[in-house]
């Protein structure tokens, strides 16, 4: 008799999820020699232990603590790049600017990037059919709680000048409900972080507006200032040229505004 299975509104666990997590862990330790002390089998066991046999709407940050401990990593605290709704460009940037790091450049972020996972209460099965949607089902689901946990820790570790890349093509350039707006902003430590510098990325070729004057950016400035952290903002009018100039800063065309 087939067991009744809870149907959630979100997509199910990514196919080959265990294999992918394990393979990503091994790849990461291959290309980041400083992380070769990490035992990838233990990492997978801790990852699995955070959500297997647990109700997928009842996951807590505590569930992920064994994984967080195994994935502890020191990144230069003054080289952190946060992003909101513009992941690809942020990753292209850190791929060129090798001394800066997004969350997905760390082991735990790399392991989970673009994956979905959940289990079922009281069974050791992974649910490949459906997983809870943050809006339609519940916020305390395995994926959301994971990203909330790692994002909080990443923001807490930041110091000096922290950069954030924001998508200037969105109606809300700064969105209070994004991971950046709801987690990272509130976990920057004022005693360590001097300035949050926002880079607003323009989408249109002919868009010469100063998006740093956008009301949502002013809202971000207000939140940050109230936390005793300075705020600065730059328009990146030409993201393609911006990346090119990061690659080749001595190029003559890189002295003008990007």
């Amino acid at each position: 008799v087939p067991r009744w299975r809870q149907q959630w509104s979100g997509p199910g666990t990514t196919k080959r999820f265990p294999e992918t997590v394990l393979a990503r862990c091994v790849k990461y330790t291959e290309i980041h020699p400083e992380m070769r002390h990490v035992d990838c089998q233990s990492v997978w066991d801790a990852f699995k232990g955070a959500f297997i046999s647990k109700h997928p709407c009842n996951i807590t940050e505590e569930d992920y603590q064994p994984l967080m401990k195994l994935g502890t990593q020191t990144v230069p605290c003054n080289k952190i790049l946060l992003w909101s709704r513009i992941k690809d460009l942020a990753h292209q940037f850190t791929q060129v600017q090798r001394d800066m790091f997004t969350l997905e450049d760390t082991l735990l972020g790399y392991l989970a990037d673009d994956l979905t996972w959940c289990g079922e209460f009281n069974t050791s099965k992974i649910n490949y059919q459906s997983c809870p949607d943050w809006r339609k089902d519940c916020s305390n689901n395995p994926v959301s709680v994971f990203w909330k946990t790692v994002s909080r820790r990443f923001a807490e570790a930041a110091c000096d000048v922290v950069h954030v890349m924001l998508n200037g093509s969105r109606s809300k350039i700064f969105d209070k409900n994004s991971t950046f707006g709801s987690v990272e902003v509130h976990n920057l430590q004022p005693e360590k972080v001097q300035t949050l510098e926002a880079w607003v990325i323009h989408g249109g070729r002919e868009d010469s507006r100063d998006l740093c004057q956008d009301p949502t950016i002013k809202e971000l400035e207000s939140i940050i200032s109230k936390r005793n952290i300075q705020f600065s903002c730059k328009n990146i009018y030409r993201p393609d040229k911006f990346l090119q100039c990061v690659k080749n800063p001595e190029d003559s065309s890189c002295t003008s505004e990007i």
Partner: antibody
Amino acid sequence: QVQLVQSGAEVKKPGASVKVSCKASGYTFTDYIMHWVRQAPGQGLEWMGWIDPEYGSTDYAQKLQGRVTMTTDTSTSTAYMELRSLRSDDTAVYYCARVAIITTVASGGFAYWGQGTLVTVSS
Amino acid sequence: DIVMTQTPLSLSVTPGQPASISCQSSESLLHSNGKTYLNWYLQKPGQPPQLLIYWMSTRAAGVPDRFSGSGSGTDFTLKISRVEAEDVGVYYCQQFLEYPPTFGQGTKLEIK
């Protein structure tokens, strides 16, 4: 079984570009980093860089920065290495290579190699 | 970059006799995980290199037990207990402790 099959020999003029391919089979292509190594005639081995086929991220040897680009096509499990502004000292056999995984640990040694592609740069 | 230096650059051995190749690294290859990231390869004429030894002393799959690797953090040795005709070629040591991975200049083994 794991196989890495490379494209055929190429003859190029100085200043030109070459693109060498490496088709992988016998394993999940995105699960492994692909490295490229070259060997000038009668010389030793020189590591050129790596690419992560899953993310497209790369790391290149310092001396080749700006001239080399590594890419992948995950739909065909193929890795590519393009070298631009060719010089006579780029004449070499180019290899793709990957590590073995020993009980969830990368061995750190290149256990699998393509057969090699000879690139000759000559005017 | 870590510099790898091999000695001798060539050696000629009678079949059935032992052979020994040395490799020295400019820095210790011992990782905090306890593994030493030193590999040995054999490249036979017209072929790609084949991995013989990884982690300084672990034989790769299918490698005969006449091959053995040993050493400390910076000084390493590849030993062939009894050389066979098929062992001819160029032997390379390689460090994979850090990027870029670097190779020794090679040791050519021939049969007397």
